[in-house]
Each structure stands twice: as C-alpha cells, then as structure tokens.
C-alpha cells in the first residue's frame, strides 16, 4: 500500500504533504487545515492543469471566511512547476489568512505575473524565503512579486537564485526589512552584490548574511554596502574564500559605524584581513587557517573575539582541525 501523502502531527502543529504520484489526490491536503506550519512538496509536478480547474480571476473575497479559519502561520511549497497566474491566485487568497512566513523552494515559475488589481489586498508576510526558484521574467521577478505583498516584510532570504540581481528601477523600497540573506549564491560575487543591493531600497537592514556568495575581500564587500547605502549591524561573510590582502589600487573603504558584528569563520584565512572595521562588538574568526595568534595591531578593537578551530590553537596541526576552543567547547571545523 502506498503511504498517505499527508501527515499531521498529533498536536495539530505540523503537517507535511509529499505528493509523488503522477495524478495526486490534492484533497488529501485538507487534513492540514488545522496545522500551524504546513509543508507541501509536489514531487516536481507541473501545476499547469490546475489553471483549468480554478478561476484565477475569481474574487478572492468569496473565500475570505474559509481562509481566515486556517491556523497556518508558516507555509512551505516546494518541487513544482507553477504558472505565475496560479501563484498570484494563491497569494490573493492567502492575503485573507494568518500566514506570516512563506517559503518557496525548488520551483519553476512560468509566465508573467499580472499587476495587482486596485481592489486587491497584499499578503502581510513578515518573512519570505526563496531557494532555487526560477522565474520566467528574469530580473524583474522581485518587483513583480513585491506588488503582491504588503510593505511590512521583515525577513527576505534568496538562495540558489537563477537571477540574484534585480531590476532595481522597478523594485520599491522595503521599509521594514531588517534581515536580508543572500547566502548560497556562489556566483554572486562582489559585483553581483552591488547589483543585488539596490541603492536605498533596503533602508532598515540590520542583519545581512552573505555566506557562500563568492565574496573575495571584506573591503570589496564594504564598497558594495557603501554604494548601496546599506548599513547593517551584523554581517555574515562566513564560508567564502576570502583574501586577507587588499588590492593596493582599490580605494580604502570606511565601514559604517553601525556595524558591530562580523562573522569571518570558515573563510580560509591564513592571516587577519586588512581593512576591517576599527571597532566591533563581535568578531568571529573561527575555523580559519591562522597559524599564529593575531597581534593586537592586526585586530579591530573588539569585545568578543572567537578564534576557535585555528591551527595555532592546536599544537602539531597546520590546518583547521578539531581542537580546544576559547569557549572550552570542541569546534567541528
């Protein structure tokens, strides 16, 4: 017997659906109506036939009471080919729900997203996470998606993007966005970062994550942030192969005084990079290749410095290795 596609936990909290059959029984998902966190994985199916069954232009207000009764706060949709018109129809209906967090992963969005009708209500998300989502509309996808959202978005995460650069002139500002995560876009690079950080569109960013994004030097990142007018409090550059030296011809970059936490762990550093901010509250240099203890003049003025997992802390090793950390806990580097 084939397993049930949907599973609801005994607390009505988490519901997971895995639709792997070629002709899935979508009605199975109705058992998720009571769940707070819902995950729907469509097994790579093309959802085009759905358009024939639903009226994408119907007034979503007719579903308002039904949708308001949903407890769902966090929704993940993955592994499908989705017509943009169907995505828009879903967003219009979900605007009447309590949904706060939406994750889209491994999706191929086909066709273009129609403009938001004047009477339509945007979706009041606090968090939007996209991983490996491709859009037929190329660079304008964020502007098209943004019009279907209310302006209160606080967290935006875009990983494995097919087009991590945006059409900046079309994108409106994200006034409430405090966390932007562009991690796991290894082809981004510092030039791509400049293109992605549309100037003055992210005025409230406090946390910027750029793990595994092809960054080369902290100074290059500093220049991209300065060009965009982005002043994060916390910056994560871990899991990039960073160079410690700065191109002598490159102009010196002044870091924003707002920056107080910098993560440079797992960056392959053999020495402390030049051009770091003069003062930081937190600096993480763990799991690098530092063969000697950094000299005070090499480091910023820092309250909380982490050097765990560097070779100089582990006698007899020349590469990052499991050893005793400053914190007294063994790191897994």
């Amino acid at each position: 017997t084939t397993p049930e596609p949907c599973e609801l936990d005994d607390e009505d909290f988490r519901c997971v659906c895995n639709f792997s059959e070629p002709q899935p029984d979508w009605s199975e998902a109705f058992q998720c109506v009571s769940a707070v966190e819902v995950e729907i994985h469509a097994g790579g199916l093309n959802l085009e036939p759905f358009l024939k069954r639903v009226d994408a232009d119907a007034d979503p207000r007719q579903y308002a009471d039904t949708v308001k009764a949903l407890r769902v706060r966090r929704l993940t949709v993955g592994a499908a080919q989705v017509p943009a018109q169907l995505l828009v129809g879903a967003l219009r209906v979900l605007a009447y729900s309590r949904l706060k967090e939406l994750t889209l992963e491994d999706l191929k969005i086909t066709g273009t997203m129609p403009p938001l009708p004047l009477e339509a209500t945007g979706l009041a998300l606090s968090s939007l996470r996209l991983r490996n989502v491709s859009w037929a509309t190329g660079r304008s996808w964020l502007a098209e998606l943004q019009q279907w959202l209310k302006p209160g978005l606080k967290v935006l995460s875009i990983a494995q993007a097919h087009s991590p650069a945006f059409s900046c002139e079309q994108v409106r500002a994200f006034p409430a966005l405090t966390s932007l995560d562009l991690s796991d876009n290894p082809g981004l690079g510092e030039r791509g970062l400049m293109a992605a950080l549309c100037p003055h569109k992210f005025p409230a960013i406090q946390n910027l994550a750029l793990r595994n994004t092809g960054m080369e030097t902290p100074t290059g990142v500093c220049a991209a942030l300065a060009a965009a007018g982005v002043q994060p409090h916390s910056l994560d550059l871990s899991h990039n192969s960073l160079r410690a030296t700065v191109n002598p011809s490159a102009p010196r970059c002044m870091w924003s005084s707002a920056l107080n936490s910098l993560n440079l762990s797992f960056a392959g550093l053999e020495q402390v990079p030049k051009g770091l901010p003069a003062k930081l509250r937190v600096l993480d240099l763990s799991c690098n290749r530092l063969n000697r203890a950094p000299q005070p003049d090499e480091l910023p003025e820092v309250d909380n410095l982490t050097l765990d997992g560097n070779p100089f802390l582990v006698p007899g090793t020349a590469l990052p290795h499991e050893g005793s950390m400053n914190s007294g806990v063994v790191p897994a580097c």
Partner: antibody, heavy 115, light 111 residues
Framework: QVQLQESGPGLVKPSETLSLTCTVS?????????WNWIRQPPGKGLEWIGY???????SYNPSLKSRVTISRDTSKNQFSLKLSSVTAADTAVYYC????????WGQGTLVTVSS | EIVLTQSPATLSLSPGERATLSCRAS??????????LHWYQQKPGQAPRLLIY???NLQSGIPARFSGSGSRTDFTLTISSLEPEDVAVYYC?????????FGQGTKLEIK
Amino acid sequence: QVQLQESGPGLVKPSETLSLTCTVSGGSISSDSAWNWIRQPPGKGLEWIGYISYSGSTSYNPSLKSRVTISRDTSKNQFSLKLSSVTAADTAVYYCVRGLRFAYWGQGTLVTVSS
Amino acid sequence: EIVLTQSPATLSLSPGERATLSCRASESVDSYVNSFLHWYQQKPGQAPRLLIYRASNLQSGIPARFSGSGSRTDFTLTISSLEPEDVAVYYCQQSNEDPYTFGQGTKLEIK
C-alpha cells in the same frame, strides 16, 4: 516521555536582561512541535510569552514582543528566553512548555526582579 | 487577541457533587472541525497539568470524571463527582490564534 528543565538566575536587577534556558530530553526541538515560554506572576494567572518552532520560526506575544527573543541551540537540544529592560512587573515563575496544547511543562523557575 | 472569561471566579462544593466550570471566548476558537480550547488544573506550587484538549478530548492519565464540551465561543469543564484532590485553580486556554491566551482561572474549593 518529554521532559523540560528551566535554568537561569533567580534574581535580576531592574533594567537588565532576564536570561533563561530550557533543556529538553526525550524529544528533539528541531524535529517537531512548538517550544514555548509561559510565565505566572505570584498569585496571578498564566501569560504566554512566545514560542520557537521545530523549524526555527518564532511567534511572540505582542505585549512583550519589543523586549523578547527566543532562540535555540539544536546541538544541545535547548531553547532560551531573553527578556530585556525588566521591571518588578516581570517577577514571575517562568515555565518552558512543549506544544500549543501545553501537555508537557517544566517545573518552573521563580525569577525576581529587584535591586 | 482572543479574551477568555471564566466563571465563576470561585466555586465551593462538597465531595461527590458535580462541578461545572464555564469559559467564554470573545470570538470563535474553532478552525473547521476542531475547537482549539484546552483545560488545565493547577495545584499550589505546581506547574499546570493538561486535562482536556480540543474542547472534549481527555488527556491520557487524567481520571474519567473530568470531561469537556462546547464549540465556537462557549465551553464547559465538568467534574462529575468531586474528589478532595480536585482542589485547584482551573484555567482554559485557546490555541486557535496567537497570541495564545488563558482565562483568568476558576478556584475550586471543597466545603
């Protein structure tokens, strides 16, 4: 059988940050459910503070949202509460609790806010 | 937020009597077929204990003299025959929407 155990200082000075940790045994905080903090001022009723879910998603009581952070350390199977800028009104027994129908409770820890 | 109002504030009954505790919500706590209203018992110096979940389901290990009923906004906890150990404060709580809220409690005393 899921068991929860609160730990942290019993006395916090006004304007400082209250920090508590809940250690969970008999269940993984990253595989299912919501992991809550609930408090009860002496002689009063119960107030939900917020939760962190198996996915890392958080939800906070709007009345405390500006002062509350709930985080987790999945390697230690622990979740934590930080409540900033405390006053005497934050004196309470603090419980960590599993689920949204609160079936599993820690024994509670009394935190007194006083100079 | 959903406000839960419990009545009476105090209930004083003799052993063997039937106790009826009420909880009224300011708006529906139903989501489709389920009512997300739960009942707890708290004895002095102890953490609360879940008695009834989703309005009418008896939590495992709880004596059968406890039962719950109701839907949408009106709910009742019934103790069919009071035992001396039932002296406690009883709270209702809703988990239909955040912030998840509790009633102010009903104190049950034995005469």
